[in-house]
């Protein structure tokens, strides 16, 4: 069988949801010594980067200026060390936002609920769309989808204090073109009667995977380059 290098890791810097006309930055983390990185969009070659010097850096950044719906979609990357190519990275969905209009978001029974109650978010957008998305801030990978002509429901619960946080919704014109975000709705979940509102909540971690962790090589890193890839893939 043909030998390949471990697959790289593709990430969006800061966020995979990019407002239209803004710049998107994608990182491809491969291996020290890689001489070429290729970014593929919807299966076709989109851009090429050659790190300088290749043996000193374990990845590259691809800058995508002037984001629009034609550049939104599925990206992947590969890299080359000498004549040997890597496996293809996982796919990354890059979304363009701030298209057209702004939806409104409401929550039932209200923004302050008690643990155990069921909650429904309603997202409304009058312009033609069929898919709606609900995201919790700090958990932007956990997208809930719902369908409707001008509005959609997102039932939740019974809620716990882990549901606390700020929520926004989007209307979607296709999988990769989203509206402006709604104004946030902050959900406050108080504990059971016995626990009161001081019940602890799960911390809302930022989207820590949406950062580019490209590192310059040290002597030790050079020896452990392949181990690094294995560990990164395990972490993912």
């Amino acid at each position: 069988p043909k030998q390949t290098l471990p697959k790289p890791i593709i990430r969006a810097e800061s966020t995979y949801m990019v407002p239209k006309e803004k710049q998107a930055t994608l990182c491809c983390q491969g291996s020290y010594g890689a001489v070429e990185y290729q970014l593929h969009f919807e299966g076709s070659l989109f851009a090429v980067e050659r790190p300088k010097p290749p043996e000193r850096i374990n990845g590259v950044k691809f800058h995508i200026p002037d984001m629009n719906s034609r550049k939104a979609g599925r990206y992947s990357c590969i890299y080359r060390v000498g004549e040997l190519w890597s496996e293809r990275s996982d796919l990354l969905d890059l979304v363009v936002t701030e298209m057209y209009d702004t939806p409104t978001l409401s929550v039932h029974p209200g923004p302050e609920v008690t643990s155990g109650e069921k909650v429904t978010f309603y997202c409304r957008l009058d312009t033609a769309t069929s898919m709606f998305l609900l995201l919790k801030e700090g958990r932007s990978r956990d997208v809930q989808r719902s369908y409707g002509k001008v509005q959609a429901e997102f039932p939740m619960g019974p809620v716990t204090t882990a549901h606390r946080g700020s929520y926004r919704c989007f209307g979607s014109y296709n999988n990769y073109a989203w509206s402006f975000p709604s104004e946030p709705v902050k959900l406050l979940v108080t504990g059971d009667i016995e626990n009161t509102s001081l019940a602890p909540t799960d911390p809302t971690f930022p989207d820590s995977w949406d950062t580019c962790l490209l590192t310059r090589e040290t002597g030790l890193q050079k020896d452990l380059a392949l181990w690094d890839h294995t560990a990164q893939n395990l972490l993912r």
Partner: antibody
Framework: QVQLQQPGSVLVRPGASVKLSCKAS????????MHWAKQRPGQGLEWIGH????????NYNEKFKGKATLTVDTSSSTAYVDLSSLTSEDSAVYYC????????WGAGTTVTVSS | DIQMTQSPSSLSASLGERVSLTCRAS??????LNWLQQEPDGTIKRLIY???RLDSGVPKRFSGSRSGSDYSLTISSLESEDFVDYYC?????????FGGGTKLEIK
């Protein structure tokens, strides 16, 4: 304190439409859901639908789609239910109720459909 | 739609007696349940929300509880003004639905 003022009664002809009002005071009108419910004489309560004055989001009981239309006028803090093509089956007391958990209730409007 | 089966539909009891009314939910509603009181003139007042939380101004003789899909309203010691109609209401899943009601009569 919260008050939801509804007209006491209204008499309408079969086939006609009627718009019932619910004037809210004592709270921020745009921040709470407004529900409407129906109660036929000697019967239980049925939920018609609700509307959020801030977002305009509304949701209906399937049974009342085409029969009831919910609207709000935020400038006067008033919610409305429009009932169309009235028949004797629509003779009932109609209540408005504030808040997602039906916190407060109006006194109800008695609608009598009769020729 | 979620069905709320309320029992009994009517109940005769004496002053000072302890009574319980029950609503059974056909699907999971979590703690999203109210108990409402309706007077003969039609006035509706919420007594309990979120299964067991007492509204302000409601006497402590009223309490709410849950066991699985069964939700109960208990009046610990009946007073004359308690002999009216009671409804449960689930607000977990649209369309929100009411129980059929319980008429509490004085024995």
């Amino acid at each position: 304190q919260v008050q939801l003022q509804q007209p006491g009664s209204v008499l309408v002809r079969p086939g006609a439409s009627v718009k019932l009002s619910c004037k809210a005071s004592g709270y921020t009108f745009t921040s709470s859901w407004m529900h409407w419910a129906k109660q036929r004489p000697g019967q239980g309560l049925e939920w018609i639908g609700h509307i959020h004055p801030n977002s305009g989001i509304s949701n209906y009981n399937e049974k009342f789609k085409g029969k009831a239309t919910l609207t709000v006028d935020t400038s006067s803090s008033t919610a409305y239910v429009d009932l169309s093509s009235l028949t004797s089956e629509d003779s009932a007391v109609y209540y408005c109720s504030r808040g997602g958990r039906f916190d407060d209730w109006g006194a109800g409007t008695t609608v009598t459909v009769s020729s | 739609d979620i069905q709320m089966t309320q029992s009994p539909s009517s109940l005769s009891a004496s002053l000072g007696e302890r009574v319980s009314l029950t609503c059974r939910a056909s699907q999971d509603i979590g703690s999203s349940l109210n108990w409402l009181q309706q007077e003969p003139d039609g006035t509706i007042k919420r007594l309990i929300y979120a299964t067991s939380r007492l509204d302000s101004g409601v006497p402590k003789r009223f309490s709410g509880s849950r066991s699985g899909s069964d939700y109960s309203l208990t009046i610990s010691s009946l007073e004359s003004e308690d002999f009216v109609d009671y409804y449960c209401l689930q607000y977990a899943s649209s369309p929100w639905t009411f129980g059929g009601g319980t008429k509490l009569e004085i024995k």
